[in-house]
């Protein structure tokens, strides 16, 4: 085959080698880009700048070689369009700094970085990390600071991330109450903070104030629904980024659900409660107290981890005609209490029938509350014979 | 698999107390009752009472109402009993067993109380 | 409490014989169930829910009753069923258990 005349070659089925002096001096317009899966550069010295535009439509890049050229500044962004990138060789151009965004959300099994004259800085305090663990190839390289020495000797006593403190109300919240959280952000070399709220939604009407280093927030007009909803402040350095989640509890009375029993390995009656704060249970049988036993107790579903519901059953691991009749739950908390109840009918009575009668020998319980009286299908259901004797 | 780890013996004096563990391990500890049944010297089974370390709720054997004491630490998914004013009549196996839906499922080894002077 | 009385405290049987063991309650129970024991072990659960055998329980044993009667029956004695089993209720508290049947090999 004729030499390629080329700035950048095919090389393999998705890989493009650009090394002719001088040829590039940006990444556009690479020739079959969304394909490629290997680029390799070399010798591009008017090649200086990385850029998100650099690599946009290189969705399928894995491996990315770019050495002995002019590279000075690879943006914080710049591989944001090739998530799959799992190889970076930078090495021998003219680095002095590669910020922690740059690989932040990449899964780099290599990062070369030799070569460069890099600047011993808190901005690379995350290099230096990777190199104490091992990550990314990166030991080997016994990477060297410009005129300092080596990375692995750099001071990073003062090189931590921003430290955050949310304040939140002490005080009871109540349903249409406004709060205001601050978010006090310290630390050196601050660029920029924020909130995440995605989990808001419609809990609240949400307004921001202020700036590096306080944050503020109102909540104002609160719904019950902002209970287990993380509210997240978050600060970035040239080191890192920190995150804070903090959660306001918006107090609301207790409520409660019962549902008809089913059998789930054995007997449920199924019960669903809220408030905040969480309502202690009880539950009463045709009006009496009801001790829990290791044969009927109440068992809790996992709760979701973003709402005040629990959902859970009242268990009757053998209940028999004996456990026949009225469930009633009572639920209560500091603002309110609530209560449900339910009919259940597990067995008919082996002991209530006419001698006339013909003698049942398997049942099918029924359980009915206020709106329904569907029959409940009974699997596994023991035959039960009584014999009688009539004098 | 699921285990109930109990010492193997207790030498106690007339008069004193003992407290049993029962280590559980190879499932969920809060999710099942704990039992605890004794069985004296060729003798038959005793149930002395059970707790649920969900939400710590205790059932006891009337018989051992004023002696017996259940308790569980979550963190370490061991479950104790405690029994005091100890007699030579209370020497004897001591098993803990767990339930959830269906009884005592799975056994301890069993703790040898003896209760001598 | 519930009292359970088992039939009979002692027996034997010779390998291939059926064996029937009974557990009487004083008051009625929805279920009854059985533990194996054998000498210096733990209770094995062996029946529960008056009929359903435990994992690993062998097909020749059954159980069956109702009310205040309840039985365990082995179809053909073998060497390895040899054992005390308790009878057990589960629908009041104290649990309580009956004082065993030891059934010996002839």
């Known amino acids: 085959a004729a030499p390629c005349p080329d700035a950048c070659c095919p090389h393999g089925s998705s890989g493009l080698r650009c090394t002719r002096d001088g040829a590039l001096d940006s990444l556009h317009h690479l020739p079959g880009a969304e394909n490629l899966t290997e680029l390799y550069i070399e010798n591009q010295q008017h090649l200086q700048h990385l850029e998100l535009r650099d690599l946009r439509g290189l969705g399928e890049l894995r491996n990315l070689t770019i050495v002995k050229s002019g590279l000075r500044f690879v943006a914080p962004d710049a591989f944001h369009f090739t998530p799959r990138l799992s190889r970076l060789n930078l090495s021998f151009n003219a680095l002095e700094s590669l910020s922690w965004k740059t690989v932040q959300g990449l899964s780099l099994q290599e990062l070369v970085l030799s070569g460069n004259p890099l600047h011993c800085s808190c901005a690379l305090r995350w290099l230096q990390r990777w190199e104490e663990e091992g990550l990314g190839g990166v030991p080997e390289q016994k990477l060297q600071c410009h005129g300092q020495g080596p990375l692995a000797h750099m001071p990073n006593a003062s090189c931590g991330v921003p430290t955050l403190k949310v304040q939140v109300p002490n005080a009871s919240v109540d349903v249409g109450d406004d709060v205001l959280l601050r978010c006090q952000v310290e630390g050196r070399g601050l660029e920029q903070a924020g909130w995440i709220l995605t989990e808001l939604e419609q809990s609240a009407t949400v307004m921001k104030s202020g700036g590096l280093p306080s944050l503020g927030l109102t909540l104002a007009n609160v719904t019950s629904d902002l209970n287990r909803k993380n509210v997240t402040c978050w600060a970035e350095n040239d080191v890192g980024r920190a995150e804070v989640s903090v959660q306001v509890n918006v107090s609301f009375p207790a409520s409660v659900q019962l549902h008809t029993a089913v059998e789930m390995h054995h007997w449920c009656i199924p019960f669903s409660v809220d408030g905040q704060p969480a309502p202690s249970l009880r539950w009463l049988f045709n009006g009496s107290v009801l001790n829990e036993t290791s044969f009927i107790f109440t068992e809790f579903l996992e709760p979701a981890a973003n709402e005040t519901v629990r959902h859970g059953c009242l268990r009757l691991n053998q209940p028999t005609h004996v456990n026949n009749g009225n469930y009633t739950l009572l639920a209560a908390n500091p603002f309110g209490q609530a209560s449900a109840s339910i009919m259940a009918a597990f067995m008919d009575n082996p002991f209530e029938f006419n001698p006339e009668d013909p003698i049942p020998v398997s049942f099918s319980p029924v359980d009915t509350n206020s709106t329904s009286g569907d029959p409940v299908e009974k699997k596994d259901e023991t035959p039960f014979g009584v014999s009688v004797a009539v004098g | 698999q699921v285990q109930l780890q109990q010492p193997g013996a207790e030498l106690v004096k007339p008069g004193a107390s003992v407290k049993l563990s029962c280590k559980s391990s190879g499932y969920t500890f809060t999710n099942y009752w704990m039992h605890w049944v004794r069985q004296r010297p060729g003798q038959g089974l005793e149930w002395i009472g059970e707790i649920y370390p969900n939400n710590g709720r205790v059932n006891y054997n009337e018989k051992f109402k004023n002696r017996a004491t259940l308790t569980v630490d979550i963190s370490s998914s061991t479950a104790y009993m405690q029994l005091s004013s100890l007699t030579s009549e209370d020497s004897a196996v001591y098993y803990c067993a767990r339930s959830r839906y269906d009884p005592m499922e799975d056994w301890g080894q069993g703790t040898s109380v003896t209760v001598s002077s | 409490q519930v009292v359970l009385t088992q039939s009979p405290a002692i027996m034997s049987a010779s390998p291939g014989e059926k064996v029937t063991m009974t557990c009487s309650a004083s008051s009625s129970v929805g279920y009854m169930h059985w533990y194996q024991q054998k000498s210096g072990t733990s209770p094995k659960r062996w029946i529960y829910?008056?009929?359903k055998l435990a994992s690993g329980v062998p097909t020749r044993f059954s159980g069956s009753g109702s009310g205040t009667s309840y039985s365990l029956t082995i179809s053909s004695m073998e060497a390895e069923d040899a054992a005390t089993y308790f009878c057990?209720?589960?629908?009041?508290?104290?649990?309580?258990f009956g004082s065993g049947t030891r059934l010996e090999i002839k």
């Open positions: 057990q209720q589960w629908s009041s508290i104290p649990l309580t």
């Open positions: 829910d008056t009929s």
